[in-house]
């Protein structure tokens, strides 16, 4: 009976449910288009349960299919600003290991100041996700305007 | 053996899977920026399994991490209208209890007539979510254009 | 004890976790606004675990509440192009069986070149989802710009 009891933990402990929601920490230095993220209850409503941060980039700890979602809002932005500084583009991709490098999700701002999207994608343990923002406009660091997260969905 | 059997119900019964998808009922009176929601199979494809509606606002019944998503489309809207009535902003937040009041998700329409986004956030039993639409434009009540939902993801 | 062991498979095998992420294959012939999808590991990062494709349209194999998500980016598009070719609209709906035909999700491009959204909706075994793109602009087939997916959430 004890074995059946222990097995009950599978969904949460062994099977997955890895999840993370991150807030923007800072942008990279010039020539580095990556956004650098941070997470943890001390910072507000961001958290990491399973995945980890590696120098501000999100590293996956469990193989599976994940729902990846992101919202980025440009600070000091109006539709005029956005169109004048076009193209401003956000791309989410696997940036390491190099052998698995691929763009997963890409959006342009055009005349808007916010992009938001989500997708399902297979990710493997060790995959590091990078979010590249190209253009001169900077993202808002407000936690309700800019965030990035993943949710393990199934093996 | 019966105990192991009963335990099998955990994922659905005890562990969570609370979920709700709501459709717009009406906007608030002047000076009340909140959108008022409704849900239930008699209304179409909206539903509440766990969370409840309290005067048109969504109240959470189970602690956990939730995926919150929303789409709002402005009625009688073109990109010209949207920019002329800028700023029109949508914010989703915890509005009660007051001690936990916080904005979770915020988007401006700029030159667009629809906003859509989603995020992961910890919510606690008793948290009431409010969706505030500021500006003079009214939202569409078409069920495929304006909707709001939550999905329990993990404890 | 063996019975309790077998039951552990419920979440993955019996209980659901049907999931699919598709990439654009092609648009329909004139007068057919539907987008035709494809999926499978040989094509990249698209997949079908449970649902199936029927002539490029997604058919559901398990009753339940699903998270449906989509992103469509218009090819050869700028905010000027998008507004000049307005209205360009995307609608996701159940297109068969005819008795259950309904629009689930609808968005216009206005001055933008990408739409992205998601919603929870009940779907039944045999429901076929169609994605209709109306207007003269064509969607990008880049797999990080245009995709469509569903995720089983609960019974």
């Amino acid at each position: 009976q004890r074995f059946a009891q222990a097995q009950q933990q599978l969904p949460l402990e062994s099977l997955g449910w890895d999840v993370a929601e991150l807030q923007l920490n800072h942008t990279g230095p010039q020539q580095d288009p990556r956004l650098y993220w941070q997470g943890g209850p001390a910072l507000g409503r961001s958290f990491l349960h399973g995945p980890e941060l590696d120098k501000g980039q999100l590293r996956i700890h469990r193989d599976g299919i994940y729902m990846v979602h992101i919202q980025v809002t440009l600070a000091i932005c109006s539709s005029t600003t956005a169109s004048r500084h076009h193209p401003t583009t956000l791309a989410v991709g696997i940036c390491s290991p190099a052998s698995r490098s691929i763009s997963l999700l890409r959006l342009s701002f055009h005349q808007g100041c916010t992009i938001a999207s989500q997708r399902l994608t297979p990710l493997a343990r060790g995959d590091t996700l990078c979010t590249n923002l190209t253009g001169t406009l900077l993202p808002s660091r407000n936690t309700d305007e800019t965030f990035f997260g993943v949710q393990w969905v199934r093996p | 053996q019966r105990f192991a059997q009963a335990q099998q119900q955990l994922p659905l019964e005890s562990l969570g899977w609370d979920v709700a998808e709501l459709q717009l009922n009406h906007t608030g009176p002047q000076q009340d920026p909140r959108l008022y929601w409704q849900g239930g199979p008699a209304l179409g494809r909206s539903f509440l399994h766990g969370p409840e509606l309290d005067k048109g606002q969504l109240r959470i019944h189970r602690d956990g991490i939730y995926m919150v998503h929303i789409q709002v489309t402005l009625a009688i809207c073109s990109s010209t209208t949207a920019s002329r009535h800028h700023p029109t902003t949508l914010a989703v937040g915890i509005c009660s209890p007051a001690s936990r009041s916080i904005s979770l998700l915020r988007l401006s329409f700029h030159q667009g007539c629809t906003i859509a986004s989603q995020r992961l956030t910890p919510l606690a039993r008793g948290d009431t979510l409010c969706t505030n639409l500021t500006g003079t434009l009214l939202p569409s009540r078409n069920t495929d254009e304006t909707f709001f939902g939550v999905q329990w993801v993990r404890p | 004890q063996r019975f309790a062991q077998a039951q552990q498979q419920l979440p993955l095998e019996s209980l659901g976790w049907d999931v699919a992420e598709l990439q654009l294959n092609h648009t329909g012939p004139q007068q057919d606004p539907r987008l035709y999808w494809q999926g499978g590991p040989a094509l990249g990062r698209s997949f079908l675990h449970g649902p199936e494709l029927d002539k490029g349209q997604l058919r559901i194999h398990r009753d339940g509440i699903y998270m449906v998500h989509i992103q469509v980016t218009l090819a050869i598009c700028s905010s000027t192009t998008a507004s000049r070719h307005h209205p360009t609209t995307l609608a996701v709906g159940i297109c068969s069986p005819a008795s259950r035909s309904i629009s689930l999700l609808r968005l216009s491009f206005h001055q933008g070149c990408t739409i992205a959204s998601q919603r929870l909706t009940p779907l039944a075994r045999g429901d076929t989802l169609c994605t209709n793109l109306t207007g003269t602009l064509l969607p990008s087939r880049n797999t990080d710009e245009t995709f469509f997916g569903v995720q089983w959430v609960r019974p």
């Epitope: 010039q30 600070a75 000091i76 406009l137 808002s140 305007e145 | 902003t89 401006s108 | -």
Partner: antibody, heavy 122, light 107 residues
């Protein structure tokens, strides 16, 4: 077009409280995108940020003045105000109100009032 | 707090010449740096935000560059109305701070 206008006494005695009001037109202090701020400039010197108030009522002050400064907002009048307690002659300056655009970590100022000179003298 | 040091304190140039103003931060401010112009008896006016983005209505002769700790404001060809004091300001973190200013005067 957003316009800001400072008002208040031009002369304040040492140890008293300096009180200024900024009236906003062409925009709303209730907007959830802007940080309504006060900045001062002593005669012939540089600019010093004093603090801001956000639509929600949250405030942020310069630590060098934190114990003496209070910023408040009156959304019904579309105004925000500055109070600086226990003033000395070192507080003599032109005081500007301004609209801050950016995020909760920091803003820059895209619209300014014309400024009002406040002299601290007995 | 982050200290911003502007140099030179005064720049004497003739109309039509190129002006190069420098702002150095005591620690990295990423690209969160703005430039303002102030004329006597007037409020400052925002020229550049976030290192390189021209504010609405600012002529193309004004440009900003830099990242981290070193920033530059360039006026490609000075017009008579450009003679004024210029301030940099960081919004990387609180408290917001301004540089001491550079006066651009007619030679």
């Amino acid at each position: 077009q957003v316009q800001l206008q400072e008002s208040g006494p031009g002369l304040v005695k040492p140890s008293e409280t300096l009180s200024l009001t900024c009236t906003v037109s062409g925009g709303s202090v209730s907007s959830d995108y802007y940080y309504w701020s006060w900045i001062r400039q002593p005669p012939g010197k540089g600019l010093e940020w004093l603090g801001y108030i956000y639509y929600s009522g949250s405030t942020n002050y310069n630590p060098s003045l934190k114990s003496r400064v209070t910023i408040s907002v009156d959304t019904s009048k579309n105004q925000f105000s500055l109070k600086l307690r226990s003033v000395t002659t070192a507080d003599t300056a032109v005081y500007y109100c301004a609209r801050g655009d950016g995020d909760f970590m920091g803003v820059c100022f895209d619209y300014w009032g014309q400024g009002t000179l406040v002299t601290v003298s007995s | 707090e982050i200290v911003l040091t502007q140099s030179p304190a005064t720049l004497s140039l003739s109309p039509g010449e190129r002006a190069t103003l420098s702002c150095r931060a005591s620690q990295s401010v990423s690209s969160y740096l703005a430039w303002y112009q102030q004329k006597p008896g007037q409020a400052p006016r925002l020229l550049i935000f976030d290192a390189s983005n021209r504010a609405t209505g600012i002529p193309a002769r004004f440009s900003g560059s830099g990242s981290g700790t070193d920033f530059t404001l360039t006026i490609s060809s000075l017009e008579p109305e450009d003679f004024a004091v210029y301030y940099c300001q960081q919004r990387s973190n609180w408290p917001l701070t301004f540089g001491g200013g550079t006066k651009v005067e007619i030679k």
